[in-house]
Structures are given as structure tokens and as C-alpha cells.
Interface confidence: low
């Protein structure tokens, strides 16, 4: 007996071939011997089966001795043995129809779980293997669960159902609602304007919700709310903002915040949360601000950074076009009695310069100039 696998909602074509390459009489019946369809001369006749309107054939193939049964908009209950009677022969085809659905909405928040449920006909024992967009394979029976969805899980999940050494493939589009980056670091010299951007990693027609930025300054003992805002159909409106610092917020997506100037007391890390309408849970993005200051006081040239720096970062002071005078994995470096010239303070990570501040040291009778 031939086995054919079908997908719920799809169309399947079951083949039936006669030895004579001409139009002869044929009938398709189900396992209960109820006629589905057949022919009378060149006319297609239908029987009383529940398939009725969903069953068809290809009259153009009859003259070649081919009498297919086409079933549209497949249902799980269409799983059955179908019998083609032609030339005193009976050809049996077992049709097994499977469905695969996401248990909930296909738009899920980062960190939430995805459960895929397989609908299968009674008596079948399929195995399922799904491949996520990032190439991760998961296997299971009637249900497959993926906990802690990540941004890379957004996209088309390809699931293969295996039964009787035959397979059928399902594609399910999953959208993981998240910010493009889980975390970002902004490096600024003291006094510079700071731009924080929070691009979303998905696009939807209407986006409504509310958000807040909490900030933990390195110098502060506790965190505080810097700004709260609403989002209505992708339009941003500020609800409340602190006076110090007085953040400004863009009115359109992507979410965009401007800090008028980077100061050591603002250096630290923040957490922007966004609660979306009709979704449980929140989206999070961490943002970090590192501030650099280069100063000369009497005979001491100092370079300092504030904020969350990794121990791998290197802070250096060097006279322009010369080797670094001092390089340390610390948050402050200094040179006593610096020679005159343009000094560079560099914060770097494995050769990549993250932040650079220049300070001009004048001969000892003058005061320093900050370019």
C-alpha cells in the first residue's frame, strides 16, 4: 500500500494509472467503500462522500490513462485509505494528513516559550524535527517546546514530520519581539551630546505600549527613573522626565533619547523597558554610558573614565605620534610633569579605539587648552 503524507489546509494529488493509455471508467472510493468520484464518459461524477466539493480530478490526463484524485483544503479527518478502481484492478493509497500549529500567538516576547503542537491522525506515530532560523534542531513527538526564545529565533521555523519513512515539511513564521541589541555601550567625552537609540528587531502594523528608562549612575547608591513614555501606533509621547538630566525623546520609532551632555555623574547603566499592549511581559534593553575626562592640574596630566568598563579595556596617555607614555587596565591614568604638545587619552579594546580625548599641554608658563 502506497503512503502519501499531506498538510492540513493544503492540496494533495493521489495518482491512479491504467495500463491502457486512454480514457476508461474509474472510481475513487474511501475505506468504507463510499464513492468519492469517478467518470461517466467524459463527465466527472461525484459520490456522497464528505469530501464532495473538495474532491476533483484532472480530465486532461484521462486520455493518457491517468485518473488522479485531488483533495483540496485537507483536514486531519481526511486521513484514510483511498481506493482507485480501474480495469478490474484496485490501487490503494493511504493518506495521512498532519497539521502543525503554534500553541499561542506567533508574535512572542524575547525570553518567552514557543510550543508547537502536531495534529495527527489516530493510529499514526510520527516524529517531528524542527530547525530554528539560527540552525538549532529540536525533536519531539506530539508537542515541541522551546523555552527562552532569543532574537535569532525570529524567522521561519522549518519542521519535518516523519511517518512511514515519508516526510512532510511545515514552515512557521515566528516573530520574536525584542530590541535589536540586548545591550549597547555609548562612549563619550565629557560635555558631548549623547544619543541613545533603541531600535526594535521587528516590524508590526500597529505598535502600542508604554516604556520607562531606569538609570543606575556609577556614583549613585540607587537607580532612578529618568523618563517614562507612551507609544500609540508608533507615535511616542513623553509622560514624565527628570529635571536632571533633562532627556529629550524623539516622537517616532526607533525609540531615541538625547542627553544634552555627558557628565561623570551620569556615567553608568540604564535599562529601558517597553510593555506592549496585549502582551504579557516586557522588552528590555540595557544601555551603558562611559564618560572620559582629560585634565591638567599643575604638574599632573590625568585621564579618567567613568561608567561600566570591562577589565579588558586599556586606558592610555600618549603624546601625539609617539608611543604610549602610560597604558593600564584601570579607570585613571596620569603623567607627572608632561612635556608640551598635544596629548591623546585613548580608551581601547584589543586595538579598537573606543574613545579618544585630546588635551594640549603648553609650556609650563601657560595654562592647558582643551580642544
Amino acid at each position: 500500500k502506497k503512503v502519501v503524507l499531506g498538510k492540513k489546509g493544503d492540496t494533495v494529488e493521489l495518482t491512479c494509472t491504467a495500463s491502457q493509455k486512454k480514457s476508461i471508467q474509474f472510481h475513487w472510493k474511501n475505506s468504507n467503500q463510499i464513492k468519492i468520484l469517478g467518470n461517466q464518459g467524459s463527465f466527472l461524477t461525484k459520490g456522497p462522500s464528505k469530501l464532495n466539493d473538495r474532491a476533483d480530478s484532472r480530465r486532461s490526463l484521462w486520455d493518457q490513462g491517468n485518473f488522479p484524485l485531488i483533495i483540496k483544503n485537507l483536514k486531519i479527518e481526511d486521513s484514510d485509505t483511498y481506493i482507485c478502481e480501474v480495469e478490474d484492478q484496485k490501487e490503494e493509497v493511504q493518506l495521512l494528513v498532519f497539521g502543525l500549529t503554534a500553541n499561542s500567538d506567533t508574535h512572542l516576547l524575547q525570553g518567552q516559550s514557543l510550543t508547537l503542537t502536531l495534529e495527527s491522525p489516530p493510529g499514526s506515530s510520527p516524529s517531528v524535527q524542527c530547525r530554528s532560523p539560527r540552525g538549532k534542531n529540536i525533536q519531539g513527538g506530539k508537542t515541541l517546546s522551546v523555552s527562552q526564545l532569543e532574537l535569532q529565533d525570529s524567522g521561519t521555523w522549518t519542521c519535518t514530520v516523519l511517518q512511514n519513512q515519508k516526510k512532510v515539511e511545515f514552515k512557521i513564521d515566528i516573530v520574536v519581539l525584542a530590541f535589536q541589541k540586548a545591550s549597547s555601550i555609548v562612549y563619550k567625552k565629557e560635555g558631548e551630546q549623547v544619543e541613545f537609540s533603541f531600535p526594535l528587531a521587528f516590524t508590526v502594523e500597529k505598535l502600542t505600549g508604554s516604556g520607562e528608562l531606569w538609570w543606575q549612575a556609577e556614583r549613585a547608591s540607587s537607580s532612578k527613573s529618568w523618563i517614562t513614555f507612551d507609544l500609540k501606533n508608533k507615535e511616542v509621547s513623553v509622560k514624565r522626565v527628570t529635571q536632571d538630566p533633562k532627556l529629550q525623546m524623539g516622537k517616532k520609532l526607533p525609540l531615541h533619547l538625547t542627553l544634552p551632555q555627558a557628565l561623570p555623574q551620569y556615567a553608568g547603566s540604564g535599562n529601558l523597558t517597553l510593555a506592549l499592549e496585549a502582551k504579557t511581559g516586557k522588552l528590555h534593553q540595557e544601555v551603558n554610558l562611559v564618560v572620559m575626562r582629560a585634565t591638567q592640574l599643575q604638574k599632573n596630566l590625568t585621564c579618567e573614565v567613568w561608567g561600566p568598563t570591562s577589565p579588558k579595556l586599556m586606558l592610555s596617555l600618549k603624546l601625539e605620534n609617539k608611543e604610549a607614555k602610560v597604558s593600564k587596565r584601570e579607570k585613571a591614568v596620569w603623567v607627572l610633569n608632561p612635556e608640551a604638545g598635544m596629548w591623546q587619552c585613548l580608551l581601547s579594546d584589543s586595538g579598537q579605539v573606543l574613545l579618544e580625548s585630546n588635551i594640549k599641554v603648553l609650556p609650563t608658563w601657560s595654562t592647558p587648552v582643551q580642544p
Epitope: 570591562s310 577589565p311 579588558k312 591623546q344 585613548l346 579594546d349 586595538g351 579598537q352 579605539v353
Partner: antibody
């Protein structure tokens, strides 16, 4: 789309110099170090040095320090490497490369197609 | 300088089988819980292509049949199942210490 486009092959005489280019596109040129890597025919890879186009700061592999000079032109988003006093040992393919952004920030994620230098009398 | 020794220098693997390439460093390439070892694939006439960074992280766009493991001084690149297009030379590279250095390479042939 981040791309590094290198200049074409060079045939040079022993003792001469050669200057090759690496034009960057698809990102802010002054934000990332450009590295240079040497590969002799049928052999492995050797790091030559790096230049930070933002400030012009450069850093060299001590073993190759007097051979290469690295420069960068911010206006054209192009990095250059000049090799001097060429010998047959300098016949190789030279790649420019850039590191990645996130977890792969210490690996060469983007490469130029390479410039073949042949030193021959 | 940190010396990286790759083995074997060449290997031939049947289609669909597993290829294993080893890289030993002359000193530890670990720092603060991370391993600064990367793996590259290079085909003839092409630049190297990043496969694995920080010992075990798969670079975006690289098939999941490539995997990396190890820490300290001993690292491994695995390819399973090997496909015809995997015929290439593979290099390990450390980025913990300047100058960064590469292994001597392993040439993979598909049988």
C-alpha cells in the same frame, strides 16, 4: 553591507617599494582598526599590523616592523600599506581585514579579497 | 609570541563523516572566563572566512555543522556531517595577545 576592496596585483623589482590600498564601505571607517595579514603561496597567515583611521595610530608586528608602513585617508575611506626594500620573501598575497562588532570583536570578521605582490627581477 | 600548533596538517574525510582539527597554544589563551581562539576556513584563491569566534561561538551565516570547543591551550574544530563544499584549509587564530598569531593550517580533503 560591509566590504573591503583591495587594489590589483603588483609585479615589482627587488629593492623597490609597493603601495597597496584597501577601500572600506558599509560602515564608519574611522571607528574600526584596519589590520593587514600576509600569506605566502601555499603557506599560513601572518599578522603584519594595524592602523586606527580615527587617529592614525598604528601598531606593528615586531618581526615585520621595518617592512611595512600603514596609513589611512579618512576622506576616501581607504587604508594603505607600503612595503619597502622588497625581496623574494615579500612575494605573497596581502589581505586587509576588520574585526567584528559584538562577541566577535576580537576576530577578523571581514576581509578584503587580497592583493598579490610578486617580487621578481 | 604565542605559537599555535595545528594537527593534523592534512586529513581526508568521507562525505557525511566527522572531521576533527586540533589546535594547541604554547600558553593559555583564556582571560576572565573567555577563550580568545577563533577558527577560519580558506578556499583556494579566496580570503579566509570566520567560522567560530571565542572558541565555540558560530559566526552568523555559518552552517551548524561547524562547531568549536576547548579552553586554555587545547582547542578543537569539528565539522559534521562533512559536505563537499567543506574542502578547504582551516586555521586557528589567537587574539588574547599581540601580535595575534595563526596556526599553520589543516588541509581538509573530502573523499
Amino acid at each position: 553591507d560591509i566590504q573591503l576592496q583591495q587594489s590589483g596585483p603588483e609585479l615589482v623589482k627587488p629593492g623597490a617599494s609597493v603601495k597597496m590600498s584597501c577601500k572600506a564601505s558599509g560602515y564608519t571607517f574611522t571607528d574600526y582598526v584596519i589590520n593587514w595579514v600576509k600569506q605566502r603561496t601555499g603557506q599560513g597567515l601572518e599578522w603584519i599590523g594595524e592602523i586606527y583611521p580615527g587617529s592614525g595610530s598604528d601598531y606593528y608586528n615586531e618581526n615585520l616592523k621595518d617592512k611595512a608602513t600603514l596609513t589611512a585617508d579618512k576622506s576616501s575611506n581607504t587604508a594603505y600599506m607600503q612595503l619597502s626594500s622588497l625581496t623574494s620573501e615579500d612575494s605573497a598575497v596581502y589581505f586587509c581585514a576588520r574585526k567584528g562588532e559584538n562577541g566577535n570583536s576580537l576576530a577578523f570578521a571581514y576581509w578584503g579579497q587580497g592583493t598579490l605582490v610578486t617580487v621578481s627581477a | 609570541d604565542i605559537v599555535l600548533t595545528q594537527s593534523p596538517a592534512s586529513l581526508a574525510v568521507s562525505l557525511g563523516q566527522r572531521a576533527t582539527i586540533s589546535c594547541k597554544a604554547s600558553q593559555s589563551v583564556d582571560y576572565d572566563g573567555d577563550s580568545y581562539m577563533n577558527w577560519y576556513q580558506q578556499k583556494s584563491g579566496q580570503p579566509p572566512k570566520l567560522l567560530i569566534y571565542a572558541a565555540s561561538n558560530l559566526e552568523s551565516g555559518i552552517p551548524a555543522r561547524f562547531s568549536g570547543s576547548g579552553s586554555g591551550t587545547d582547542f578543537t574544530l569539528n565539522i559534521h556531517p562533512v559536505e563537499e563544499e567543506d574542502a578547504a584549509t582551516y586555521y586557528c587564530q589567537q587574539s588574547i595577545q599581540d601580535p595575534c598569531t595563526f596556526g599553520g593550517g589543516t588541509e581538509l580533503e573530502i573523499k
